[in-house]
Every structure is written in C-alpha cells, then in structure tokens.
C-alpha cells in the first residue's frame, strides 16, 4: 500500500491531524524534499550574520558575514575576523607576515614568495607583505649578446585559502 | 578550567536599568568572542548580544537595540551587559557564553561553555 504521505510535494508536509493531507509548511518553515511529515524551522540570519538568501518554502535560509569578518563551517556556520592584507590570523590574533611570505587576501595564511630562479628567471619586482615577488627573464636573456628580451611573465595567481 | 560566572541580576521596575557582569577564568579570554543570552519563564532561549575578541564589533538581537550595550575588559576577563529602558519583557534568565574557536563568532548552537545564569525580573 502506497503511503499517502509520499505524494507531498517539497514546501508541504503532511499532516497527521487532517487525515494525512499535504498542508503548505507554516511561516518561517520549509521542506525541501517531498513526503515530509514536518517543516523545517528557517535559519534566521541575526547579529554577525547577514542574509545572503531569504528562506523559501522549499529551501533555507542562507547567511553570510558582515563586512570585516568571512564564512568559516559548512554553511557558513561562523564568522571568523577579517585581518588586512600583508597579515595572518594565529592564536595571538592578527600578525604581519614574516620576510619572505605574503598574504594578498584579508583572510588565510602568508606565502612564500615565489622564487624565481627555480624557473631559471630573475625578480623582476621584489616581493611585500602583501604581494608576490615577479619574476621576470632569465639572466641569460638579459646578457649584452641577447638579441630580444621576452616579455616578463605574468605574475602568478596565488590561490585562494580553502573555506 | 572554564568558568563563566554571572552576576548584578535582581529586581527592577520598568524603565529602570541593570549592569550584569560575567567574570571568565580557565581560557585566554582576549582571544574568544563572548555572548549574552536569555531565557523568559517558560519560553526558549534568546540570543540577546555578541561582542568580538576585541570588543570593537559589536551585535544586537532587535528587540534590545538601542536599550542594551554589550561591552568587555580584556584586563579583567569580564563581560558586561549594561541595560537601559527596561521592560516587563526582558523579564528572564540571562547567561554568558563563550565562543568555541579564537577570533570567530559562531551560532549560539555552538557556544562551548555556560555560566549559570543571573535572574532579571522587570516588575512594579
């Protein structure tokens, strides 16, 4: 016998108080598969948390951070503090990259720097606390003999932190 | 280990004003995000206010905006909650609450410790 309740189309639920009719989820609640027996309670997006998408009843509520923090947990489940570019957050809050590293992102960590010559080119642009170093020709391109210089490669896109 | 303490509850009538402290022990206090929540006789709890590590960024449930100033000192591991304009329904249990990772404000779903609370009771 086919259960009554698996003809509810997602945004319904079941109701076991009106023999088993599907009845709309109530205000500020949602189903988002079919056959449901209740609605789930929306997500509310207070304090720290912005709305990115208002809930429907067929999908949650979505949130975001405020402007000086960033999402951190499945869904956005915490807002972590922003720190400005050139730094990282550790345990002791935000610090400047050490010599040699960067960070270009106001969340993350510091990079190294590229180094050039494990390419075989020369620093075109040294590196800060807040970009990558740009490498340019190699040396050999760059002699009196050579008779064209390539152009200096781009500079590399560093990746972005995972979140 | 952890310790949230709370205190400065009672009885005040409607209008009047309450400063509530939470003195925290056990963790590096400067570090974590803190919050204040509350519980009316009989209902759920509420998110009231979050404050960051630094105490610079600051966040207000609606209904006390304006009313009710969350603030910290990071000297004295203490949290406070100052509140004005008073209501018969702020009437409740109020609780401090500690952030589970550095520098991040979470869910209230996912404060890690407790204190036990203080009773405010707004009444003529």
């Known amino acids: 016998l086919q259960d009554p309740c698996s003809n509810c189309p997602a945004g319904t639920f079941c109701d076991n108080n009106r023999n088993q009719i599907c009845s709309p989820c109530p205000p500020n609640s949602f189903s988002s598969a079919g056959g449901q027996r209740t609605c789930d309670i929306c997500r509310q997006c207070k304090g720290v948390f912005r709305t990115r998408k208002e809930c429907s009843s067929t999908s949650n509520a979505e949130c975001d951070c405020t402007p000086g923090f960033h999402c951190l947990g499945a869904g956005c489940s915490m807002c972590e503090q922003d720190c400005k570019q050139g730094q990282e957050l550790t345990k002791k809050g935000c610090k400047d990259c050490c010599f040699g590293t960067f960070n270009d992102q106001k969340r993350g960590i510091c990079r190294p720097w590229t180094n050039c010559s494990l390419d075989g080119k020369s620093v075109l642009v040294n590196g800060t606390k807040e970009r990558d170093v740009v490498c340019g020709p190699s040396p050999a391109d760059l002699s009196p003999g050579a008779s064209s210089v390539t152009p200096p490669a781009p500079a590399r896109e560093p990746g972005h932190s995972p979140q | 280990q952890v310790q949230l303490v709370e205190s400065g509850g009672g009885l005040v009538q409607p209008g009047g004003s309450l400063r509530l402290s939470c003195s925290a022990s056990?963790?590096?206090?400067?570090?974590?995000?803190m919050s204040w929540v509350r519980q009316a006789p009989g209902k759920g709890l509420e998110w009231v206010s979050d404050i960051n590590s630094g105490g610079e960024s600051t966040f207000y449930e609606d209904s006390v905006k304006g009313r009710f100033t969350i603030s910290r000192d990071n000297a004295k591991n203490t949290l406070y909650l100052q509140m004005n304009s008073l209501r018969a329904e702020d009437t409740a249990v109020y609780y401090c609450?500690?952030?589970?990772?550095?520098?991040?404000?979470?869910?209230?779903?996912?404060?890690?410790?407790w204190g036990q609370g203080t009773l405010v009771t707004v009444s003529s």
């Open positions: 056990g963790f590096t206090f400067s570090s974590y995000a």
């Open positions: 609450a500690k952030h589970p990772l550095t520098y991040t404000i979470a869910t209230m779903n996912d404060y890690d410790y």
